[in-house]
């Protein structure tokens, strides 16, 4: 049957903890993704901003399991009104502050 | 100021009974979820039960499980725990302690009474 | 039930770094809380979150949690930071809170 949504946000954050801890060089060679706005639609948003990140294995099960959490499909290049246009993070920086802020919303029950 | 006032503690002897009581003032008790902590002497902090702020839930740790039980009265700001079956290793200072509440009680622990000596000996 | 582990003692000089760790099973995935404990008093909020500090707490304070270690770091040691230091997070299998062993800081 389906994951739970809880079930499923608490395998996203042990994701995020394991790409965090495992970093020998750079995350996804430095690269660079665009900031996102943490409120509503975070989740695609986070997609739309990690999908542009190609050839970097450490991320790709992220990738898959964000889309589990957006409603619709996403594609390389799309952008929604939740990214900080004018900010560019490196990629490891982007996990650590969607990594805690998941963990916020896991202790407040926001599961979806 | 933002307050929490334990009473109630005192030495009691193995296999009876203690009611803890904690006054807080100062801060509107009805939203918070309220804990217990406790310190044996020389050791270290011992996390012993939780309610919710509206009173729906309770956890307890396995220690004390089956004999302490955890209530609040929002209508007069006051916690309490009730001590059952006490046993020489219950012996410790008790500490009231609020915590803001989400859906899980996993907030940081930000207001501390300065807590109150049980004793339990023969 | 969820264990964290943390080292008895840490000692440092004035002015030094002071570093205490708390150990635990995917510890990153949890939001970890820190405080201290002077002696004869009751325990005090220094960290929340992770890495979140209350305002009353100096900057010198900070927390970070990667992977299976919490880290408490305190800048720049005082004499008056010399306490116990206890790490805490909730342990959501079991829906009860869980206090590290503690560590105790000694300013040479």
């Known amino acids: 049957g389906p994951v739970p949504p809880s079930t499923a946000l608490r395998e996203l954050i042990e994701e995020l903890v394991n790409i965090t801890q495992n970093q020998k060089a750079p995350l996804c060679n430095g690269s660079m993704v665009w900031s996102i706005n943490l409120t509503a639609g975070m989740y695609c948003a986070a997609l739309e901003s990690l999908i542009n990140v190609s050839g970097c294995s450490a991320i790709e099960k992220t990738q898959r399991m964000l889309s589990g959490f957006c409603p619709h499909k996403v594609s390389a290049g799309q952008f929604s009104s939740l990214h900080v246009r004018d900010t560019k993070i490196e990629v490891a920086q982007f996990v650590k502050d969607l990594l805690l802020h998941l963990k916020k919303l896991f202790r407040e029950g926001q599961f979806n | 100021q933002m307050q929490l006032v334990e009473s109630g503690g005192g030495v009691v002897q193995p296999g009876r009974s203690l009611r803890l009581s904690c006054a807080a003032s100062g801060f509107e008790f009805r939203t918070y979820g309220m804990h217990w902590v406790r310190q044996a002497p020389g050791k270290g902090l011992e996390w012993v039960a939780v309610i919710w702020d509206d009173g729906s839930n309770t956890h307890y740790a396995d220690s004390v499980k089956g004999r302490f039980t955890i209530t609040r009265d929002n209508s007069k700001n006051t916690l309490n725990l009730q001590m059952n079956s006490l046993r020489a290793e219950d012996t410790a200072v008790y500490y009231c302690?609020?915590?803001?509440?989400?859906?899980?009680?996993?907030?940081?622990?930000?207001?501390w009474g300065q807590g109150t000596m049980v004793t339990v000996s023969s | 039930s969820y264990v964290l582990t943390q080292p008895p003692s840490v000692s440092v000089a004035p002015g030094e770094t002071a570093t205490i760790t708390c150990g635990g099973n995917?510890?990153?995935?949890?939001?970890v809380h820190w405080y201290q404990q002077k002696p004869g008093q009751a325990p005090v909020l220094v960290i929340y979150d992770d890495s979140d500090r209350p305002s009353r707490i100096p900057e010198r304070f900070s927390g970070s949690n990667i992977g299976n270690t919490a880290t408490l770091t305190i800048e720049r040691v005082e004499e008056g930071d010399e306490a116990d230091y206890y790490c805490q997070v909730w342990d959501y299998s079991s829906d009860h809170m869980v206090f590290g062993g503690g560590t105790k800081l000694t300013v040479l």
């Open positions: 995917l510890i990153g995935a949890r939001l």
């Open positions: 302690v609020r915590a803001p509440q989400w859906y899980l009680t996993a907030e940081a622990f930000d207001l």
